[in-house]
């Protein structure tokens, strides 16, 4: 594989990042962090070593900036499960809270 | 105790629709969603759909979309089950569970006692 | 959607001896699975869940094993009350699905 399509891979599973996030600030629903998280490290994955590698990246320096800024340890290791549980491959579905809009 | 209690047995005519209901008792009704699952002599036991207590969105298996449609009342605990355009394929027995969480993914540890639902012309 | 497979459909013992139900997943569904007992004209009960963990109040002569695909529960030393039907249930992804049942009867 070459250097261009891991970069490729990494710029699209940013994407996949970036859309999971935003969505879960405009659904704002209760109970449906853990399944955006899993859902953003999934679709990163899904595109190969360069996204799967872009969603280690970002999550990482998410939560150093979450724990710069006082996130709860039980929250970070909860949201840290939720994106390992993505990026191996798993059903993001199974963190999905009841009732979330079909959009998503 | 967790209890939940179903309304009483229908019996309805082709066509038409029925609304049966299930309270929740003895637990924080929002803190749990609520699911509905049928069960009849072909099916065996069938997952319809989930309604969240809190916000009153429902989700449901793309084989029932249409057909049922769920609700529900915080003031009095209670979620109901509206099913449309019944025939017989729709005669069976319909039970509420309560989720062990929000989430859809889920066992049920409490269920209604079931409500016997018969079309018949 | 996840489809599940039990076997066997029906099987006759006595009280006293030992059982195995299974219950087989048409894909990964790691150790997201369920397990209830039903008898005539009752609700379903929870016996097991997360393959394994048995539910508050269950007798400990059940128990549940397996991950990925394949799954079982073992009832050991058969009472009068175990008799009637078991239904295995996935947890896994949406839509949740039971079982085909298995009917367990008195020989």
């Known amino acids: 594989r070459s250097f261009f399509s891991f970069l490729g891979e990494a710029f699209d599973g940013a994407r996949d990042m970036w859309r999971a996030y935003s969505d879960m600030r405009e659904a704002n629903y209760i109970g449906s962090d853990k399944y955006f998280h899993a859902r953003g490290n999934y679709d990163a994955a899904k595109r190969g070593p360069g996204g799967a590698w872009a969603a280690e990246v970002i999550t990482d320096a998410r939560e150093n900036i979450q724990r710069f800024f006082g996130h709860g340890a039980e929250d970070s290791l909860a949201d840290q499960a939720a994106n390992e549980w993505g990026r191996s491959g798993k059903d993001p579905n199974h963190f999905r809270p009841a009732g979330l809009p079909e959009k998503y | 105790q967790v209890q939940l209690q179903q309304s009483g047995a229908e019996l309805v005519r082709p066509g038409v629709s029925v609304k049966i209901s299930c309270k929740g008792s003895g637990y924080t009704f929002t803190d749990y969603a609520m699911h509905w699952v049928k069960q009849s002599h072909a099916k065996s036991l069938e997952w319809i759909g989930v309604?969240?207590?809190?916000?009153?969105?429902?989700s449901y298996n793309q084989k029932f979309k249409g057909k049922a449609t769920m609700t529900e009342d915080k003031s009095s605990s209670t979620v109901y089950m509206e099913l449309a355009r019944l025939t017989s394929e729709d005669s069976a027995i319909y039970y509420c569970?309560?989720?062990?969480?929000?989430?859809?993914?889920?066992?049920?540890?409490?269920w209604g006692q079931g409500t016997l639902v018969t079309v018949s012309a | 959607d996840i489809q599940m497979t039990q076997s066997p459909a029906s099987l006759s013992a006595s009280v006293g001896e030992t059982v195995t139900i299974t219950c087989r997943a048409s894909?990964?569904?790691?150790?997201?699975l369920a397990w209830y007992q039903q008898k005539q004209g009752k609700s379903p009960q929870l016996l097991v869940y997360n393959a394994k963990t048995l539910a508050e109040g269950v007798p400990s002569r059940f128990s549940g094993s397996g991950s990925g695909t394949q799954f079982s529960l073992k009832i050991n030393s058969l009472q009068p009350e175990d008799f009637g039907s078991y239904y295995c249930?996935?947890?896994?992804?949406?839509?949740?699905?039971f079982g085909t049942g298995t009917k367990l009867e008195l020989k």
């Open positions: 569970a309560r989720g062990s969480s929000i989430m859809i993914t889920s066992w049920f540890a409490y």
């Open positions: 309604i969240n207590t809190y916000y009153g969105d429902a």
């Open positions: 894909e990964n569904i790691y150790s997201y």
């Open positions: 249930q996935h947890h896994y992804g949406t839509p949740l699905t």
